[in-house]
């Protein structure tokens, strides 16, 4: 009886199992019982990344500079181009279709994790004893100045946005 299912890397057509084309190649003509599947390599700037029976290769992705994109990994006949974002920007999705500017951490917040081409800045509130008085995509929360180590006393308490103000100790009269 003619086959109704085929092995891995084969496909069923006209009651016959034909070999799929390997990654990097496209289908030109199905096999017959006299000749094997005819496949051709993908052209320049084209790819197919699976065993397939596609009659056309896919175009390599274009990393559009106007959208802040640049090439992270060049495409091959078997893989698509991988894009990432320019410095200071990050991808809006896993597919990295567009980029947005890294967020900055507002005063009172410090950078917990610096942004990459694929992830945004992660901010954290400055805990007691730490402060950030700038809006930054790089600066962590800084510890309050230790007045004691300078033989000074706290004249004004610190907050999450301001450092403590140190001053001289009162002298005994």
């Amino acid at each position: 009886e003619p086959p109704t299912a085929c092995r891995e890397k084969q496909y069923l057509i006209n009651s016959q199992c034909c070999s799929l084309c390997q990654p990097g190649q496209k289908l030109v003509s199905d096999c017959t019982e006299f000749t094997e599947t005819e496949c051709l390599p993908c052209g320049e700037s084209e790819f197919l990344d699976t065993w397939n029976r596609e009659t056309h290769c896919h175009q390599h992705r274009h990393c559009e500079p106007n959208q802040g994109l640049r090439v992270k990994k060049e495409g091959t006949a078997e893989s698509d181009t991988v894009c990432t974002c320019e410095e200071g920007w990050h991808c809006t999705s896993e597919a990295c279709e567009s980029c947005v500017l890294h967020r900055s951490c507002s005063p009172g917040f410090g950078v917990k994790q610096i942004a990459t081409g694929v992830s945004d800045t992660i901010c954290e509130p400055c805990p007691v004893g730490f402060f950030s008085n700038v809006s930054s995509a790089f600066e962590k929360c800084h510890p309050w100045t230790s007045c004691e180590t300078k033989d000074l006393v706290v004249q004004q308490a610190g907050t999450n946005k301001t450092d403590v103000v140190c001053g001289p100790q009162d002298r005994l009269r």
């Epitope: 003619p2 006209n14 009651s15 017959t32 019982e33 006299f34 094997e36 005819e38």
Partner: antibody, heavy 117, light 107 residues
């Protein structure tokens, strides 16, 4: 035992017709693709035509396309080659062969076709 | 059609010799190649299929190799019954085509 026996060859004038037969035995004929291969006197082998199993497609070499017709009768375990508009260059021994995995594993003894006036 | 070119066209060798016949395709055919042996007045016999697989019942002194466009048939130690004509045949593209043959003669 697999056997393929060709018949129907002979002398024919240019422009004439001939029908070759190939009687198969010793295997399930309908399950196999079959083909005709020819060999001109003192020359090499030339694949002429093939027919798929289970009434599959038919295929021809460019040199015979439109003039030759391959067919099969699974109830009679017989392969045919109808040859029309014969030319001198069709003179050859014609072999029928069984196909398996893209190779011809069993061949008949051949039948001679001579096209001459 | 794909052209298959065999070399040499003829070859003289002695019993016990190691013999290599080559076959070149006009374009890549992966490993889609068969080898046949034909003796005078007889039908061809399948020796090697898929470039390197030995057909059942064929002696192990016959071997095949190659892929893409260049293929070889090797007989490791010639026996008297090996003197014959050898043909390669591609099945990578329609229609299947044969090489012109290599005649192996006794030296």
């Amino acid at each position: 035992e697999v056997q393929l026996l060709e018949s129907g060859g002979g002398l024919v004038q240019p422009g004439g017709s001939l029908r070759l037969s190939c009687a198969a035995s010793g295997f399930t004929f309908s399950s196999y693709a079959m083909s005709w291969v020819r060999q001109a006197p003192g020359k090499g082998l030339e694949w002429v035509s093939g027919i798929g199993s289970y009434g599959g497609g038919t295929y021809y070499a460019d040199s015979v396309k439109g003039r030759f017709t391959i067919s099969r009768d699974n109830s009679k375990n017989t392969l045919y080659l109808q040859m029309n508009s014969l030319r001198a260059e069709d003179t050859a021994v014609y072999y029928c062969a069984r196909y398996v995995n893209f190779g011809m594993d069993y061949w008949g003894q051949g039948t001679l076709v001579t096209v001459s006036s | 059609d794909i052209q298959m070119t065999q070399s040499p066209s003829s070859l003289s060798a002695s019993v016990g010799d190691r013999v290599t016949i080559t076959c070149r395709a006009s374009q890549s055919i992966s490993s889609y190649l068969n080898w046949y042996q034909q003796k005078p007045g007889k039908a061809p016999k399948l020796l090697i299929y898929a470039a390197s697989s030995l057909q059942s019942g064929v002696p192990s002194r016959f071997s095949g190799s190659g892929s893409g466009t260049d293929f070889t048939l090797t007989i490791s130690s010639l026996q008297p019954e090996d003197f014959a004509t050898y043909y390669c045949q591609q099945y990578g593209r329609n229609p299947p085509t044969f090489g012109q043959g290599t005649k192996l003669e006794i030296k």
